[in-house]
Amino acid sequence: AITEAREEAKPYPLFPGPFPGSLQTDHTPLLSLPHASGYQPALMFSPTQPGRPHTGNVAIPQVTSVESKPLPPLAFKHTVGHIILSEHKGVKFNCSISVPNIYQDTTISWWKDGKELLGAHHAITQFYPDDEVTAIIASFSITSVQRSDNGSYICKMKINNEEIVSDPIYIEVQGLPHFTKQPESMNVTRNTAFNLTCQAVGPPEPVNIFWVQNSSRVNEQPEKSPSVLTVPGLTEMAVFSCEAHNDKGLTVSKGVQINIKAIPSPPTEVSIRNSTAHSILISWVPGFDGYSPFRNCSIQVKEADPLSNGSVMIFNTSALPHLYQIKQLQALANYSIGVSCMNEIGWSAVSPWILASTTEGAPSVAPLNVTVFLNESSDNVDIRWMKPPTKQQDGELVGYRISHVWQSAGISKELLEEVGQNGSRARISVQVHNATCTVRIAAVTRGGVGPFSDPVKIFIPAHGWVDYAPSSTPAPGNADPVLII
């Protein structure tokens, strides 16, 4: 039997006697788009008529009275089986049982979906003693029901180690559709199909879905939830949402933006962070990425010298961290630098070109054709060389550094001389006779000291020897030339 009760209906007795009723709902307004009627019904379904014997879990007590008459079986009386009500309403339901007075300390516990309800619930147990039996009513109330209150509620009582279980009371909380899956923002390739998913649940079911694109409905006929919308492709950005309808009203999902992937905008604000003789550290602010992650970037470097051949050096790097050290550059040179980045769609245009310069460096090669000979009359060693090629000076030559090492009978001492940039010869005093003098020369710029030339050795005899000949930097493959005079 289905009993429909308006929410203002009076409670009705569960079984003969002066006991409170089984169902009560309050008048909390439903937070939904209301239907035309002026009230929200609460429906109560009872599997059997009230008062009919219980067929569920029954305890047959073994204890007998003085006349040895067995006590009747113990069972919870029937109550409403199914309560339907709107979200945010109040509800009260109960279990009742008559227990012979011979049983002491009987307690009733409430269970929902197989789990005992402990703590912060509004459960009240009332006792109505009589001569032979005590009627026990356990009431359970929820002031403002939510979807999470949906479920099957039962009462349990323990007597003589026997468990008595009531029939379940099903609570069904109805409300506006509730989204379990909403469409997600996406970045998609132009004219390429993609799917959007929308899923909503009641109760009440069914829930029907309408799709909306840029404020216009996509489907004339609703689809049952869940719904997958296949969009054949877009040429421009669009906003999609879905509407979920049930008998209580409608809920609208969030609107999601579907962007069309495009090539990135060019990087901006290319900046020089640090310059050395042979490298330049640059950073840039990436342009808009076209709704697709940057994959890598390309740094293009051109010599800014009008006499250069105009060739472009290209350096590829990862997109992060928008920073790159350009290496293998010439010292004291001017360069134009541009940056371009790519995503899955393609390359951006090149950033505005910026001008950058490398600093002065130490020379990269040593002076050439170093020659050493002894001028015995003045007791000097004369040194001659050729300056390194201008290209490899890496700066403006400010002079030379000469290292001369004197070795004699286990004693060794090194001396350093600085010479100005004008000229390509020098004269050093003989420090020790009957010794070997080893000479090396390096070019010097403001950027530092370059590499030293290969060593050239000359033997300085004791006083009185006259024959001498120059010693010079060896040809490749000849090591450590020594001239003995």
Partner: antibody
Framework: EVQLQESGPSLVKPSQTLSLTCSVT????????WNWIRKFPGNKLEYMGY???????NYNPSLKSRISITRDTSKNQYYLQLNSVTTEDTATYYC???????????WGQGTTLTVSS | DSVMTQSHKFMSTLVGDRVSITCKAS??????VAWYQQKPGQSPKVLIY???TRHTGVPDRFTGSGSGTDFTLTITNVQSEDLADYFC?????????FGGGTKLEIK
Amino acid sequence: EVQLQESGPSLVKPSQTLSLTCSVTGDSITSGYWNWIRKFPGNKLEYMGYINYSGSTNYNPSLKSRISITRDTSKNQYYLQLNSVTTEDTATYYCARWNYLYYFDYWGQGTTLTVSS
Amino acid sequence: DSVMTQSHKFMSTLVGDRVSITCKASQDVGTAVAWYQQKPGQSPKVLIYWASTRHTGVPDRFTGSGSGTDFTLTITNVQSEDLADYFCHQYSTYPYTFGGGTKLEIK
């Protein structure tokens, strides 16, 4: 002024998923780069990843299999999801904005997360 | 990843003194280094970026120097409000990494 505020649970059980929210005021998350950084009890800072103005993301390779950063532009919020957490993920989690001069110029106050059973 | 090592976990100094906090990178990071200060109960704040550029509003007693692999944050005329953790941070390579931090204590 730009302000960032992290929110989320303070306790998560091992193997569960951590979800944090960063709410941004004073700037739009549709411009710039928005990051997550965490600081372990021993004081070590670890960069986790970012979501940028267009929704593109990039993650620290050490976390790539477990991390997801998403956003909701209508709320001006971005989110961190870290799957299969262990006690090693116990840390203070910060959200921060990346400045194009190459530093994190605005940080949230941080939210402390403990992973424990 | 480029590992940033701050060899001193703690440093102690007197008000008015000068202190240098060092940071070493495991590979050349050029000048792509920032320094952050984190006071107790607060979030980190940037002091220095590009190794030596002072952030707006940072007192000039904070100076950054170094390039390549060795970096230094120097605080001259230390004040009591400088009690904090100091972190270096490299952004030359992704993922960005931080040093382990140096806690500055005021005697």
